[in-house]
Interface confidence: medium
C-alpha cells in the first residue's frame, strides 16, 4: 500500500539533509531556480522549480520524491501561481529553505 505521509515526509527530509550537509562545492554548480511560496501547494511548486535543473545528479532523488507528493504530472517549463517569479535563488538555498520549512511541519505534525 501507499507509504504513510509521515514516513514519506521523513524520508524527504532525510534526503534534503543528506544533500545540504554533504556539500563540498556549490550544489548543481550554483544553478539558479525560481523561489516559491512555502504554502499549501509547495510540493508541486518545489518540483516545478527544481525540475528545470538538469544534469545535477545530487537532486534527482529529491525530484523523484517530490513527484510522489504532487498529484499531477510536472514537466520542465511548467509554473504555478506559487512561484515568486521575480526572485531566483541558488539551488542550495532553495533546498535548505525547503528543508527548514519541512522540519517545522514535521515537528508540528502536519504530514500532508
Amino acid at each position: 500500500g501507499p507509504v504513510p505521509p509521515s514516513t514519506a515526509l521523513r524520508e524527504l527530509i532525510e534526503e534534503l539533509v543528506n544533500i545540504t550537509q554533504n556539500q563540498k562545492a556549490p550544489l548543481c554548480n550554483g544553478s539558479m531556480v525560481w523561489s516559491i511560496n512555502l504554502t499549501a501547494g509547495m510540493y508541486c511548486a518545489a518540483l516545478e522549480s527544481l525540475i528545470n535543473v538538469s544534469g545535477c545528479s545530487a537532486i534527482e532523488k529529491t525530484q523523484r520524491m517530490l513527484s510522489g507528493f504532487c498529484p499531477h504530472k510536472v514537466s520542465a517549463g511548467q509554473f504555478s501561481s506559487l512561484h515568486v517569479r521575480d526572485t531566483k535563488i541558488e539551488v542550495a538555498q532553495f533546498v535548505k529553505d525547503l528543508l527548514l520549512h519541512l522540519k517545522k511541519l514535521f515537528r508540528e505534525g502536519q504530514f500532508n
Epitope: 539533509v17 556549490p26 542550495a92 514535521f106
Partner: antibody, heavy 122, light 108 residues
C-alpha cells in the same frame, strides 16, 4: 522533570578501562538519539560518540574509534560508554546529551547531563 | 574532517550587541546550532537550525547563516550572558558531530 545523570567517572591508570553510565528520566528515552561529548580541562567541547534511538547505528570520533563502545538499554533508560585502553588525553568531563531522533542526523543537543570527570593518570 | 573556526574571545559593553562568528566551508548549506556554557556548568542550547530559539531562551539571542559564516547575535547584552559559546554542525563525511573551538564572551 527531564534529566540526564552521568556516573562512573574517576581516576584510572593509562591502559585501564572505565565504564560510564547515563540515567535518563522525565522523557521517553527510547525515541531519542543519544551522544557522549567530552571536555578536557580548560578546553572546548569534543564529540565522542552517538547511538540511534533503537541502538541500530553507532558512530565514533576518530580519537576513540576501536577503544570506546557506546551502548544503550531502553528498558532501563540507560546510556553507557565503555572506555578501554585509556590514555592521558582522554582526561575530561564526559557529558551525555540527547538529540531529537526523527531524522537521525544534524539535530541539536537539547538536553545535557551535568557531566562526570574522568582522569587518566599514573 | 570539517573544521569550524571561532574567534577565541569577544568583548562587549552591557546593553550593546555581541556578534560571535563561526566559519566553515559552505557552512551556509549546513544546519548550525549554538550552545552557551557557563563556568562549571553543562552547555545549554541557545539557537538551533541556524536561527530558531528554544522556548526558554530570550529573544535577545538570534542566529544567521550564509556563505562561509554563521553568526550568533546577542542584543542588549547582560552580565549574565558572560560565558563560552560553541557552534556545532553535523559532518556527513565523518558521520559525526563537529564543534567550533568556542568563543569566550566577556561583558565589560
Amino acid at each position: 522533570q527531564m534529566q540526564l545523570v552521568e556516573s562512573g567517572g574517576g581516576v584510572v591508570q593509562p591502559g585501564r578501562s572505565l565504564r560510564l553510565s547515563c540515567a535518563a528520566s522525565g522523557f521517553t528515552f527510547r525515541t531519542y538519539g543519544m551522544h557522549w561529548v567530552r571536555q578536557a580541562p580548560g578546553k572546548g567541547l569534543e564529540w565522542v560518540a552517538d547511538i540511534w534511538y533503537d541502538g541500530s547505528n553507532k558512530h565514533y570520533a576518530d580519537s576513540v574509534k576501536g577503544r570506546f563502545t557506546i551502548t544503550r538499554d531502553n528498558s532501563k533508560n540507560t546510556l553507557n560508554l565503555q572506555m578501554n585502553s585509556l590514555r592521558a588525553e582522554d582526561t575530561a568531563v564526559y557529558y551525555c546529551a540527547r538529540a531529537p531522533q526523527w531524522y537521525l542526523v544534524a539535530e541539536p543537543f537539547d538536553l545535557w547531563g551535568q557531566g562526570t570527570m574522568v582522569t587518566v593518570s599514573s | 574532517s570539517y573544521v569550524l573556526t571561532q574567534p577565541p574571545s569577544v568583548s562587549v559593553a552591557p546593553g550593546q550587541t555581541a556578534r560571535i562568528t563561526c566559519g566553515g566551508n559552505l557552512i551556509g548549506s549546513k544546519l548550525v546550532h549554538w550552545y552557551q556554557q557557563k563556568p562549571g556548568q553543562a552547555p545549554v542550547l541557545v539557537v538551533y537550525d541556524d536561527s530558531d530559539r528554544p522556548s526558554l531562551i530570550p529573544e535577545r539571542f538570534s542566529g544567521s547563516n550564509s556563505g562561509n559564516t554563521a553568526t550568533l547575535t546577542i542584543s542588549r547584552v547582560e552580565a549574565g550572558d558572560e560565558a563560552d559559546y560553541y557552534c556545532q554542525v553535523w559532518d556527513s563525511s565523518s558521520d559525526g558531530v563537529v564543534f567550533g573551538g568556542g568563543t569566550k564572551l566577556t561583558v565589560l
